[in-house]
């Protein structure tokens, strides 16, 4: 039947790909930052928030040196992932004052989800093991009330301006020893 | 039409405060974020500080942070700019900016400037 | 910090000539966060191209950006006289906003 399969075709240049990965985290980071902004103008938070369902930072700035390509990139991957599904749950459960961040929230979520595309794309022409399938994540409850929703809007927009951040140190560094 | 008029510059000594003011009118001041961008004689533009319209959020540069504080007062449609602890090195024109469109943070329209020297 | 380096320094010109300004972007910033601004001695600066390659309002056509990730032009097509000025570029993605040092455009 032919000769095997042979490996996975690598972008003639990864860091072309990787660049453009970047340049999308960077865009991604400033909306992010526009539109915590606006959230705390338009609902003033009382100090930090938390959620529990939230992924943990994955790194601090300093333990950058030590990153692996294909680590950065799947738990990357992963905690955009949960971004994502926690900005669409905060779209269809926040509540009638979230409506106000509209379509601001609507366009950060489908630049989320082209970001996760392209770190998908980036995994596969760098030839990295794609990820298991992920395991349907549990629901998330919806907030105990419109304060609870503001909340937790401040809480996933603060975080995921700082994975975002981390994101962008991390695939610089990484850039550099392609 | 956009205007912004900035007041309050002068001679200070090193050391010394100054409250610069920023009299905005023709547009919506209260949806706009503000900045203060600054230009030593005969140098190039250095951004200064950023406040959304609720003020909710501000940003410094590094060289001013801690000194300088922004603030803003939508009822009057007025920008500030307190500076304390003056040096020579923040000797310039000091101009204020709207942004394009809200929370774009950009540089859209500017005043003419007023010029703060720090000197003995 | 993102520093913006632009090139040259100086560019002397005649009126009816073309003028390619270069701005070096020390990282890999999106398009849309790229500015140019255009002073005249004693005046305020003001938006030129906004987004790389948007004329702001009342701009003339001759003035058109162009570029991407780290390298951005800045081109006015036929020069007149009341064009020469010194002119910045300037990044908004990250947080300190920066500018470039300035190409000052004079007349040959």
């Known amino acids: 039947p032919g000769p095997p399969p042979g490996p996975p075709r690598v972008s003639p240049d990864p860091r072309a790909e990787l660049d453009s990965t970047v340049l999308l985290t960077r865009s991604l980071l400033a909306d992010t930052r526009q539109l915590a902004a606006q959230l705390r103008d338009k609902f003033p938070a009382d100090g930090d928030h938390n959620l529990d369902s939230l992924p943990t930072l994955a790194m601090s700035a300093g333990a950058l040196g030590a990153l692996q390509l294909p680590g950065v990139l799947t738990r990357l991957r992963a905690d955009l992932l949960s971004y994502l599904r926690h900005v669409q749950w905060l779209r269809r459960a926040g509540g009638s004052s979230l409506k106000t961040l509209e379509p601001e929230l609507g366009t950060l979520q489908a630049r989320l989800d082209r970001l996760l595309r392209r770190l998908q794309l980036l995994m596969s022409r760098l030839a990295l093991p794609q990820p298991p399938p992920d395991p349907p994540a549990p629901p998330l409850a919806p907030p105990s009330s419109a304060w609870g929703g503001i909340r937790a809007a401040h809480a996933i927009l603060g975080g995921l301006h700082l994975t975002l951040d981390w994101a962008v140190r991390g695939l610089l560094l990484l850039k550099t020893r392609l | 039409e956009v205007q912004l008029v900035e007041s309050g510059g002068g001679l200070v000594q090193p050391g010394g405060s100054l409250r610069l003011s920023c009299a905005a009118s023709g547009f919506t001041f209260s949806s706009f974020g503000m900045h203060w961008v600054r230009q030593a004689p005969g140098k190039g533009l250095e951004w200064v500080a950023y406040i959304t319209p609720g003020s909710n959020t501000i940003y410094y540069a590094d060289t001013v942070k801690g000194r300088f504080t922004i603030s803003r007062d939508n009822a009057k449609n007025s920008l500030y700019l307190q500076m304390n602890s003056l040096r020579a090195e923040d000797t310039a024109v000091y101009y204020c900016a709207r942004e394009y469109s809200s929370y774009d943070e950009g540089f859209a329209y500017w005043g003419q400037g007023t010029l703060v020297t720090v000197s003995s | 910090e993102i520093v913006l380096t632009q090139s040259p320094a100086t560019l002397s010109l005649s009126p009816g000539e073309r003028a390619t300004l270069s701005c070096s972007v020390s990282d890999l910033i999106p398009s849309q966060y790229l500015h140019w601004y255009q002073q005249k001695p004693g005046q305020a600066p003001r938006l030129l191209i906004y987004r790389t390659s948007n004329r702001a309002s009342g701009i003339p056509a001759r003035f058109s950006g162009s570029g991407s990730g780290t390298d951005f032009t800045l081109t006015i097509s036929s020069l007149e006289p009341e064009d020469f000025a010194v002119y910045y570029c300037?990044?908004?993605?990250?947080?300190?906003?920066?500018f470039g040092q300035g190409t000052k455009l004079e007349i040959k």
């Open positions: 300037q990044q908004g993605v990250d947080v300190p906003f920066t």
